[in-house]
């Protein structure tokens, strides 16, 4: 951890590498002071998507994250964003380790390690820091695509990561185009995959206290279909009266089996977007349909709470496509003076 150059304030720590995910274990009651890079200007700290106030026990102040005395509820994900561009400068997870609050003099000092800040961190066997990014194990991708497998982990001492293919050490030397091992990102990247890349890819993460592993199964398809295509204008912006029934339509074209999700955009703690930049959504319906069918979302007896943005999300083994529409719900007495739908056109998006 590098020390800040700001001398007029109390020293603070800066996470090791910018734009790298990092996990820090903090003792209960310990003060935390973290810098957001080497400048104090134009940097804001967020916790779980909400910007930290500049005053209080936990505050984001002059580009610094300050916690007077670490409490269990302070654990979580913290982001430092550059104002304007909203670039993520630091992506940090703080974990609480209350074992540090009761260190007695007769403990074996080898079980603890200290950082340059003078804070003491316990040694810890490797663990997954973002298991939600490892939820999908079985992969099937078209030949020519780029494949990225990630096993984000942490531990103390900092663990090392090794990759195996079908149980054997894998360095990509026999692979045309080789591989990219990005140890800081705990990732393996293979570009332009071919059928000979099929297999089981295992990340082995280990330090002196233990090891963990996770396997991905990769199939390479010798064809190149496209992600789903959604018919323009569907779903359509709709205006309805309280108590009426509404149908939102989504017509999907896909040569690969499409899966459809209907999402409703929601607001959490006054925000429509999470710290990752993605909107907060509620999944209303998930279904598999046969190609070129119309998928319908039925909303019965709508109320004012049903108003808002709805998204039809279609995915297949190649990628995702989505389109959105707005539902306006009017009280019954308003029916006489407006029948217009909102001005905004449906949104059209395609994502790989």
């Amino acid at each position: 951890l590098e020390a800040s150059e700001e001398m007029e304030q109390e020293p603070c720590l800066a996470p090791i590498l910018e734009q790298q995910e990092q996990v820090l274990t903090v003792a209960l009651g310990q003060p935390v002071r973290l810098c957001c890079g080497r400048t104090e200007r134009g940097r804001h700290w967020y916790k779980e998507g909400s910007r930290l106030a500049s005053a209080g026990r936990v505050r984001g102040w002059r580009g610094r994250l300050e916690i007077a005395s670490f409490l269990p509820e302070d654990a979580g994900r913290y982001l430092c964003l550059a104002r304007g561009s909203m670039t993520v400068v630091h992506n940090l997870t703080l974990l609480m380790d209350d074992s540090l609050t009761s260190i007695s003099n007769d403990e074996d000092p080898k079980t603890l390690s200290s950082s340059s800040s003078g804070h003491v961190y316990p040694q810890q066997a490797p663990y997954w820091t973002h298991p939600q990014r490892m939820e999908k194990k079985l992969h099937a991708v078209p030949a020519g695509n780029t494949v990225k497998f990630r096993c984000p982990a942490a531990g103390n001492p900092m663990p090392t990561i090794h990759w195996l293919k079908d149980g054997q050490a894998f360095h990509g030397e026999n692979r045309i185009g080789g591989i990219r091992l990005r140890h800081q990102h705990w990732s393996l990247v293979m570009e332009s995959v071919v059928p000979s890349d099929r297999g089981t890819y295992t990340c082995l993460v280990e330090n002196s206290l233990g090891s963990i592993r996770y396997s991905y199964l990769l199939d390479v398809l010798e064809r190149s279909p496209h992600r789903p295509i959604l018919q323009a204008g569907l779903p359509a912006n709709t205006t309805a009266v309280v108590g009426s029934d509404v149908e939102l339509l989504c017509k999907v074209y896909s040569d690969a089996q499409p899966h459809i999700q209907w999402l409703k955009h929601v607001v959490i703690n006054g925000s429509s977007f999470g710290a990752d930049g993605f909107p907060y959504v509620q999944v209303l319906k998930t279904t598999d349909i046969n190609s070129s069918e119309v998928e319908v979302l039925y909303l019965r007896n709508v109320s004012a709470e049903d108003a808002g943005e709805y998204t039809c999300l279609a995915g297949n083994s190649i990628g995702l496509s989505y389109q959105s529409a707005w539902l306006t719900v009017l009280p019954e007495e308003d029916l006489t003076w407006t029948t217009a739908t909102p001005e905004a056109a449906s949104h059209h998006h395609h994502h790989h």
Partner: antibody, heavy 120, light 112 residues
Framework: EVQLLESGGGLVQPGGSLRLSCAAS????????MGWVRQAPGKGLEWVSV????????IYADSVKGRFTISRDNSKNTLYLQMNSLRAEDTAVYYC?????????????WGQGTMVTVSS | QYELTQPPSASGTPGQRVTISCSGS????????VHWYQQLPGTAPKLLIY???QRPSGVPDRFSVSKSGSSASLAISGLQSEDEADYYC????????????FGTGTKVTVLG
């Protein structure tokens, strides 16, 4: 309607062979990982094998490795399990199942099963 | 054969809450998503719930799951007679090679 229909079960002597089939309908078979799961009479579920969409990647439980072969014919929407050197402990109902990425790689669709009895 | 351990049986009266535990290791539940299956008497298993309380359509929200470390549990609140079935947890396992493993199974009986 999404459906899986197994066939090919029956009575076979120890050391004998049998080939099970699973006909898929109602979904694009060639885009799914598929597997076999078995259940001995009065016992729990045991995973047997899985095959990738292209058929190019197969994985087996240790208990059947070297004796069973999973395969598929995407043009016929059919999954197969070739069982050789059968033993009494292979007696079970064999289920064909689909693994779905949207169900986080769980087996989301199952067939009704076909009974395999290994006995002399 | 079984890497995941479940209690053989659980029971409750209608309306009660029943919980089934599923114990594994770091190579299966500790690193992988847990799936739960329900098998009604004389029928094929069906996917009941997976991941972070995600359910196939038609599965009531009386069923919920939790996971901590290398263990998981399935809770059935407001037990109903139609919940009488065998329940299996399952997970992919990465110990030496990837494979899929089921729990030993739990028979849920609705009393009265």
């Amino acid at each position: 309607e999404v459906q899986l229909l197994e066939s090919g079960g029956g009575l076979v002597q120890p050391g004998g062979s049998l080939r099970l089939s699973c006909a898929a309908s109602g979904f694009t078979f060639s885009h799914y990982w598929m597997g076999w799961v078995r259940q001995a009479p009065g016992k729990g579920l045991e995973w047997v094998s899985v095959i990738s969409p292209s058929g190019g990647l197969t994985i087996y439980a240790d208990s059947v490795k070297g004796r069973f072969t999973i395969s598929r014919d995407n043009s016929k929407n059919t999954l197969y399990l070739q069982m050789n050197s059968l033993r009494a402990e292979d007696t079970a109902v064999y289920y064909c199942a689909r693994s779905s990425g949207w169900a986080l790689d769980a087996f989301d669709i199952w067939g009704q099963g076909t009974m395999v009895t290994v006995s002399s | 054969q079984y890497e995941l351990t479940q209690p053989p049986s659980a029971s409750g009266t209608p309306g009660q809450r029943v919980t089934i535990s599923c114990s594994g290791s770091s190579s299966n539940i500790g690193s992988n998503i847990v799936h739960w299956y329900q098998q009604l008497p004389g029928t094929a298993p069906k996917l009941l719930i997976y991941g972070n309380n995600q359910r196939p359509s038609g599965v009531p929200d009386r069923f919920s799951v939790s996971k901590s470390g290398s263990s998981a549990s399935l809770a059935i609140s407001g037990l109903q007679s139609e919940d009488e079935a065998d329940y299996y947890c399952a997970s992919w396992d990465d110990s030496l090679k990837a494979f899929y493993v089921f729990g030993t199974g739990t028979k849920v009986t609705v009393l009265g």
